[in-house]
């Protein structure tokens, strides 16, 4: 008898070169074979779960950026006053959330700010939870 | 043929909102739907194998944290004179072991430290491997 | 009906005790139960996907140290001039990446570099994915 | 010097939303947690919500939950209260307060800014 | 919920000793901070962790917190200490407010 195989995990990496002053970065998935989509500038959410998510940049000049996944709640990941970011993170996350983020500069030119290395990294540890698509 | 599901990953987030000098931290469950239990404010690790650990909390003063697994052992993690935490690891636990706190203040007062945002979590990254229950 | 047990995870954990000058850190699998396998100095990888990196050790002498996987890409982790590491890191790994230190010291002595606590785990986040035994 | 200055009081009908602001200046805005605290004509304090140094923690008083929402712009050493569905109990007068690390006493405040909810 | 009880008013005679009393279910246990509030004016911290005085607050200031009461001592009181004096503590992530006592100096 052939051995269960794993169902795909929802999963996905989306990479940022540019974030725009009171808005946010624009993200691009690299790959068409991701499990989770892209949507209006966000990640969206369709399985409820844990999610270890990492966030890697470094920006062409000093920001505060914050990592958003619901309206009226605090964000996932808040930096103050960064040139660089280089974090991990756990939250538990479900259907119809979206990541997204939001920036803020401290220069008075509302220039895009360009980023090196941008990356966001969802991976969903929960399989076997609630999903939605 | 119905392609085969998850059987659900063990892993827990508890919160707290208070830790008792020389002591630990009352840690509760808010969710019914846990797959790892609480007992005598410690997690119970019924599977062998890593776990995922993320510890959240934002403290009324300083104090030293220390998050244990097994008597006579190191702990997991260990913060000494902070006000906040959030930290991220990986370890090794197995069956019989049980995650706790031990917080000690550097006031003269033994008064209860206040907590917002306070949160462990573990997921268990290895299943199919050894649980007992 | 049984329900589907999960296949094992690709996960495995290295210690290392010693790192030699210019060259990388000794790693040994404490268990012969790992999923992965160590041959050269390296860890190999044969699955696809997105793993969790966890990296430990207090080092005798200051030193900086990197994580490779693969020729003419950029470390997982750099390190520059630390006595310690206590980091995690998420990174996607293919088939044929291997797993290896860089080590240098800032003496000019070519002495070995003793390690406590040396670890190194790694765990695969995307099982159902590719593999190549 | 210490300064927190609230503004955006308003006189607003009963469903409406509102949103007040408090601007700080005299200390590292985002290395502290901070809250709201309000005072009803003629009455006591009454907390409202609270938020951590990064924005990433918060929490409220009961009457407010769902309704309100705190957060913070550390960039702009702004504190905020985002208020909706607002009830002629709301009508306070609204303070911003910074908590000390000393069991999170609130160590300064603003003068407070006015909100009427009236139909 | 946690709940904080103060007598809502009490007189004092000028230059005696006051006595504000703040009760609470073990709040012995608990930090207690307590704030002055003159009329139209915004709260003032005048003690905090039960006895500790911020910079600027005079010595007539005191505090003690034990079994379920915590008290406010002003050991000589003067005009200028009339005013409304409320305490607080944090319990479960919230933070709670007595209802506050008005000291008239008499």
């Known amino acids: 008898q052939v051995p269960p195989q794993y169902p795909p995990i929802q999963s996905i990496r989306v990479q940022f070169t540019r974030c725009e002053n009171e808005k946010g970065c624009i993200i691009t998935s690299p790959s068409k074979d991701e499990t989770m989509k892209v949507q209006d500038n966000s990640i969206i959410i369709n399985c409820d779960g844990f999610y270890l998510i990492s966030l890697k940049g470094y920006f062409s000049e000093e920001l505060s950026l914050s990592l958003y996944y619901r309206k009226g709640r605090g964000p996932l990941f808040s930096l103050s006053k960064v040139t660089s970011v280089d974090s991990i993170g756990v939250a538990y996350l479900a259907f119809k959330d979206k990541v997204y983020f939001n920036v803020t500069t401290h220069s008075t030119s509302y220039k895009d700010i360009q980023v090196n290395g941008g990356e966001l990294i969802l991976i969903h540890q929960n399989p076997g939870g609630f999903c939605a698509y | 043929q119905v392609p085969p599901q998850y059987p659900p990953i063990q892993s827990i987030r508890v919160q707290f909102t208070r830790c008792e000098n020389e002591k630990g931290c009352i840690i509760t469950s808010p969710s019914k739907d846990e797959t790892m239990k609480v007992q005598d404010n410690s997690i119970i690790i019924n599977c062998d194998g890593f776990y995922l650990i993320s510890l959240k909390g934002y403290f009324s003063e300083e104090l030293s944290l220390s998050l244990y697994y097994r008597k006579g052992r190191g702990p997991l993690f260990s913060l000494s004179k902070v006000t906040s935490v959030d930290s991220i690891g990986v370890a090794y636990l197995a069956f019989k072991d049980k995650v706790y706190f031990n917080v000690t203040t550097h006031s003269t007062s033994y008064k209860d430290i206040q907590v917002n945002g306070g949160e462990l979590i573990l997921i268990h990254q290895n299943p199919g491997g050894f649980c007992a229950y | 009906q049984v329900p589907p047990q999960y296949p094992p995870i690709q996960s495995i954990r290295v210690q290392f005790t010693r790192c030699e000058n210019e060259k990388g850190c000794i790693i040994t699998s404490p268990s012969k139960d790992e999923t992965m396998k160590v041959q050269d100095n390296s860890i190999i990888i044969n699955c696809d996907g997105f793993y969790l990196i966890s990296l430990k050790g207090y080092f005798s002498e200051e030193l900086s140290l990197s994580l490779y996987y693969r020729k003419g890409r950029g470390p997982l982790f750099s390190l520059s001039k630390v006595t310690s590491v206590d980091s995690i890191g998420v990174a996607y790994l293919a088939f044929k990446d291997k797993v290896y230190f860089n080590v240098t010291t800032h003496s000019t002595s070519y002495k070995d570099i003793q390690v406590n606590g040396g670890e190194l785990i790694l765990i695969h986040q995307n099982p159902g994915g590719f593999c190549a035994y | 010097e210490v300064q927190l200055v609230e503004s955006g009081g308003d006189l607003v009908k009963p469903e409406g939303s509102l949103r007040l602001s408090c601007v700080v200046s005299g200390f590292t805005f985002s290395s502290y947690d901070m809250s709201w605290v309000r005072q009803a004509p003629g009455k006591g304090l009454q907390w409202v919500a609270y938020i951590s140094f990064d924005g990433r923690s918060t929490s409220y008083t009961d009457v407010v939950k769902g309704r309100f929402t705190i957060s913070r712009d550390n960039a702009k050493t702004t504190l905020y209260l985002q208020m909706n569905t607002l009830r002629i109990e709301d009508t306070a007068v609204y303070y911003c307060?910074?908590?000390?690390?000393?069991?999170?006493?609130?160590?300064?405040w603003g003068h407070g800014t006015s909100l009427f909810v009236s139909s | 919920s946690y709940v904080l009880t103060q007598l809502p008013s009490k007189n004092v005679t000028l230059k005696q000793p006051a006595h504000i009393t703040c009760g609470g279910d073990n709040i012995g246990s608990k930090s207690v901070h307590w704030y002055q509030q003159k009329l139209g004016q915004a709260p003032v911290l005048i003690i905090y962790?039960?006895?500790s005085r911020p910079t600027g607050i005079p010595e007539r200031f005191s505090g003690a917190n034990s079994g379920n009461t915590a008290t406010l001592t002003i050991s000589g009181a003067l005009a200028e200490d009339e005013a409304d004096y409320y305490c607080q503590v944090w319990d479960s992530s919230a933070s709670v407010f007595g209802g506050g006592t008005h000291l008239t100096v008499l």
């Open positions: 307060a910074k908590l000390s690390s000393s069991g999170w006493s609130m160590d300064y």
């Open positions: 962790y039960d006895s």
